[in-house]
């Protein structure tokens, strides 16, 4: 009788991560008596995948009923394949022995290749806000894909960026890979509504490339411009001084009025007007009773925006032309409900 052969018909198979892999193995004879075992890898460090006689292998099922007397099919199915399952699998026939079974013959092996999709790209920006004209870095990361080939592109508002560096790790062979890219973006005053997009394309993706986004509204700080102006009011001896705070982002803003260096009133910006570009305007006004002042008054509008050092704009109020009224006080008015967009 011809000597038993272990036949693994598939030299290689490829499986998508999450699917099942069927590893085929048949023997040509029932003799010698003894079990079949499946291993990943060869040599002393090989990993036992399935033992016909003993052990618990929750992800492995046999394709045919091994308890049947004349069974010669020892194919197995491994469920929920991950990239870590990649490797060469050997179907090995053992001869019954005492106390241990003796390896009799091995199949030629089946190489299992696993294709896995990249994870959704995650884009992260700088920890601190930056102002227009500054260059900021964004990073994009995606993990767990196989094979290694992958393309990554950066876009700002649909326009492809060219200033970026990308690495795919590890450099050598691995069961799965990660990609890391850093892009440099120059901020402009119009970037409040802008988006930075990282786009990853891979052979496993049936749809369009995967995209990760970052909103520049979380990165940019647009400092305000200030303008202090004076308007007469109907009531004699009263002057309305307004401070227009224009084109700032984010909203967090505190305004202080100073009269000759002394704090007159502090208020926090509440009802803001949003501009088309996403920045905000705000207007505060101060009603000054000029008869309360003998000398000219220096009015200062001081703005602290988003925790940054204060910026200010001053206005000299000439009082010499007005008749003096003893004992009257400065009457600060409330901030206007809204300011017209510029």
């Amino acid at each position: 009788e011809e000597e038993l052969q272990v036949i693994q018909p598939d030299k290689s198979i490829s499986v998508a991560a999450g699917e099942s892999a069927t590893l085929h193995c048949t023997v040509t004879s029932l003799i010698p008596v003894g079990p079949i075992q499946w291993f990943r890898g060869a040599g002393p460090g090989r990993e036992l995948i399935y033992n016909q006689k003993e052990g618990h292998f929750p992800r492995v099922t046999t394709v045919s009923d091994l308890t049947k007397r004349n069974n010669m099919d020892f194919s197995i199915r491994i469920s929920n394949i991950t990239p870590a399952d990649a490797g060469t699998y050997y179907c090995v026939k053992f001869r019954k022995g005492s106390p241990d079974h003796v390896e009799f013959k091995s199949g030629a092996g089946t190489e299992l290749s696993v294709r896995a999709k990249p994870s959704a790209p995650v884009v992260s920006g700088p920890a601190a806000r930056a102002t227009p004209q500054h260059t900021v870095s964004f990073t994009c990361e995606s993990h767990g894909f196989s094979p290694r080939d992958i393309t990554l592109k950066w876009f700002k508002n649909g326009n492809e960026l060219s200033d970026f560096q990308t690495n795919v790790d590890p450099a050598g062979d691995s069961v799965s890979y990660s990609i890391h890219s850093t892009a440099k973006v120059v901020l402009t005053r119009e970037d409040v509504h802008s988006q930075v997009i990282c786009e990853v394309a891979h052979v496993t993706l049936q749809g369009d490339p995967l995209r990760g986004t970052a909103n520049l509204s979380e990165t940019i700080r647009v400092p305000p411009t200030l303008e202090v102006t004076q308007q007469p009011v109907r009531a004699e001896n009263q002057v309305n001084v307004t401070c227009q705070v224009r084109k700032f982002y984010p909203q967090r803003l505190q305004l202080t009025w100073l009269e000759n260096g002394n704090v007159s009133r502090t208020e926090t910006a509440s009802t803001l007007t949003e501009n088309k570009d996403g920045t905000y305007n705000w207007m505060s006004w101060l009603l000054v009773n000029v008869s309360a002042h003998r000398d000219d008054v220096k009015l200062t509008c001081q703005v602290e925006h988003d925790g940054q050092p204060a910026v200010s704009k001053s206005h000299d109020l000439k009082v010499s032309a007005h008749p003096k009224e003893q004992g009257s006080n400065t009457a600060p008015g409330p901030a206007l409900a809204s300011a017209a967009p510029l």
């Epitope: 030299k11 290689s12 490829s14 499986v15 998508a16 290749s113 294709r115 094979p147 080939d149 992958i150 393309t151 394309a201 891979h202 052979v203 496993t204 993706l205 049936q206 749809g207 369009d208």
Partner: antibody, heavy 116, light 109 residues
Framework: VQLVESGGRLGQPGTSLTLSCTVS????????MGWFRQAPGKGLEYIGI?????SPYYASWVNGRFTISKTSTTMDLKMNSLRSEDTATYFC?????????????WGPGTLVTVSS | DIQMTQSPSSLSASVGDRVTITCRAS??????LAWYQQKPGKAPKLLIY???FLYSGVPSRFSGSGSGTDFTLTISSLQPEDFATYYC???????????FGQGTKVEIK
């Protein structure tokens, strides 16, 4: 799983023609689909694909003359400004479940003849 | 665009012969190469994908090898039903585009 092309016929140069690929046994929203053609006695030529989400991508030679679109069960190829060199059998195909680098299911093809 | 050069363009062989068809890419396509069989008046049929993986239901006499730019389709023992035209097809992962070789017609000697 089946693909069937339709719409192939004799067309005049300069006119337009729309071919359809009707699928059964799977969802078009899960796979990339492609259009190919083969002129009589010649080799296979790639025209374009449409992604599972509906974005089309074309071979560089197409130059806007062909448009690929899809509904829930059909994928269409609209051909404008027909030329005699567009005479071919047109095939639709589905990419494999493991990735977009190969096509494992093909329709039988539909013949387009462009002649005056 | 990538060019795929297939050779020979035709060959004559007998049943039982070992047949080898080669395909060369103008630039590296790693292992993104498929082989198809086409018979007259029929649609192409997938034989091999990812350069070396046998598609389900395809007889084991068909095998593929190669990576980078040079690829081979081998039929170990030609059968009567194997007389057909064979095409290689590449996919380029950067341009995400497909290119076919010009075909190899396998005829009966």
């Amino acid at each position: 799983v089946q693909l069937v092309e339709s719409g192939g016929r004799l067309g005049q140069p300069g006119t337009s023609l729309t071919l359809s690929c009707t699928v059964s046994g799977f969802s078009l929203s899960s796979y990339v689909m492609g259009w190919f053609r083969q002129a009589p006695g010649k080799g296979l030529e790639y025209i374009g694909i449409i992604s599972s989400s509906g974005s089309p991508y074309y071979a560089s030679w197409v130059n806007g003359r062909f448009t690929i679109s899809k509904t829930s069960t059909t994928m269409d190829l609209k051909m404008n400004s027909l030329r005699s060199e567009d005479t071919a059998t047109y095939f639709c195909a589905r990419v494999g479940p493991l990735g977009v680098d190969y096509f494992n299911i093909w329709g039988p093809g539909t013949l387009v003849t462009v002649s005056s | 665009d990538i060019q795929m050069t297939q050779s020979p363009s035709s060959l004559s062989a007998s049943v039982g012969d070992r047949v080898t068809i080669t395909c060369r890419a103008s630039q590296s396509i790693n292992s993104y190469l498929a082989w198809y069989q086409q018979k007259p008046g029929k649609a192409p049929k997938l034989l091999i994908y990812s350069a070396s993986f046998l598609y389900s239901g395809v007889p084991s006499r068909f095998s593929g090898s190669g990576s980078g730019t040079d690829f081979t389709l081998t039929i170990s023992s030609l059968q009567p039903e194997d007389f057909a035209t064979y095409y290689c097809q590449s996919w380029h992962y950067i341009s995400r585009s497909y290119t076919f070789g010009q075909g190899t017609k396998v005829e009966i000697k």
